[in-house]
């Protein structure tokens, strides 16, 4: 959805709930910039390709994110 | 459950300015972005502002930029639509709604609205 | 602006009716589509979005299709508590828009 703005943060609302690592497509996470003062996590899910953001402060978020990034490491060389 | 209570309308003189609140409840206020929409007596929904979760994007419609401010207090649970310049094209129920907690980008369906409340701007 | 037109603007059904109401964007929205119901002198209530999720609550009586350009609300056996006026919303970008409504009525 192309926005103009000035401020280029994209999350309107945030979750607090979890996704199921099983269910992702992509996770991105955009750390703050000059164009937005805030860490933004966004979940792309595989049914639909529907894109969620995410609460970086949540605690079941934190854990997803570990989970991720240790699905990840296991899958590197 | 939740609950969404608007104040602060009233009848005004064309030219005037009014602050309108929304007191919210039953829900994480501080993860939702946040609408305004208005209805003209007799007329359909018109879609007026948002304001993202924790206040830093403002979006407006049109025909109110410029003249009407959203704003939020998370510590109060309380939403706001500054309304300056006032016109008789103004004159409408104000709803105050949440939108859908996980839509990427906005702009959202509206989860629930609150029962609104009338400005009328006449001299 | 993407605008969204809403067809028929009123109709009349009796009770046990079905009853379709059609809503077209001006331009593609993929599924970001939305429902409401009003009633005289209430708030507007959710009852789909994202063109066919049925709201928390909402009696599965109601039902929403499509996608693109092209939607449906339909109501499979209208109820008293059904006559009131309907609403669609876009929500694939700024502005949202809603479509002028139809007012459902008792024949």
């Known amino acids: 959805v192309p926005l103009s703005r000035t401020v280029r943060c994209t999350c309107i609302s945030i979750s607090n709930q979890p996704v199921n690592p099983r269910s992702l497509e992509k996770l991105e996470i955009i750390p703050a910039s000059q164009f937005c003062p805030r860490v933004e996590i966004i979940a792309t899910m595989k049914k639909k390709g529907e894109k969620r953001c995410l609460n970086p402060e949540s605690k079941a978020i934190k854990n997803l994110l570990k989970a991720v990034s240790k699905e990840m490491s296991k899958r590197s060389p | 459950q939740v609950q969404l209570v608007e104040s602060g309308g009233g009848v005004v003189q064309p030219g005037r300015s009014l602050r309108l609140s929304c007191a919210a409840s039953?829900?994480?206020?501080?993860?939702?972005?946040m609408h305004w929409v208005r209805q003209a007596p007799g007329k359909g929904l018109e879609w007026v502002a948002v304001?993202?979760?924790?206040?830093?994007?403002?979006y407006y419609a049109d025909s109110v930029k410029g003249r009407f401010t959203i704003s939020r207090d998370n510590s109060k649970n309380t939403l706001y639509l500054q309304i300056n310049s006032l016109r008789a094209e103004d004159t409408a129920v104000y709803y105050c709604a949440t939108e859908r907690g996980t839509h990427y980008y906005g702009s959202g369906s509206f989860d629930y609205w609150g029962q609104g409340t009338l400005v009328t701007v006449s001299s | 602006d993407i605008q969204m037109t809403q067809s028929p603007s009123s109709l009349s059904a009796s009770v046990g009716d079905r009853v379709t109401i059609t809503c077209r964007a001006s331009q593609g929205i993929s599924s970001w589509l939305a429902w409401y119901q009003q009633k005289p002198e209430k708030a507007p209530k959710s009852l789909i979005y994202a063109a066919s999720s049925l709201q928390s609550g909402v009696p599965s009586r109601f039902s929403g299709s499509g996608s693109g350009t092209d939607f449906t609300l339909t109501i499979s056996s209208l109820q008293p508590e059904d006559f009131a006026t309907y609403y669609c919303q876009q929500y694939n970008s700024y502005p949202p828009t809603f479509g002028g409504g139809t007012k459902v009525e008792i024949k």
């Open positions: 039953g829900f994480t206020f501080s993860n939702s972005g």
């Open positions: 304001i993202d979760y924790d206040g830093i994007i403002q």
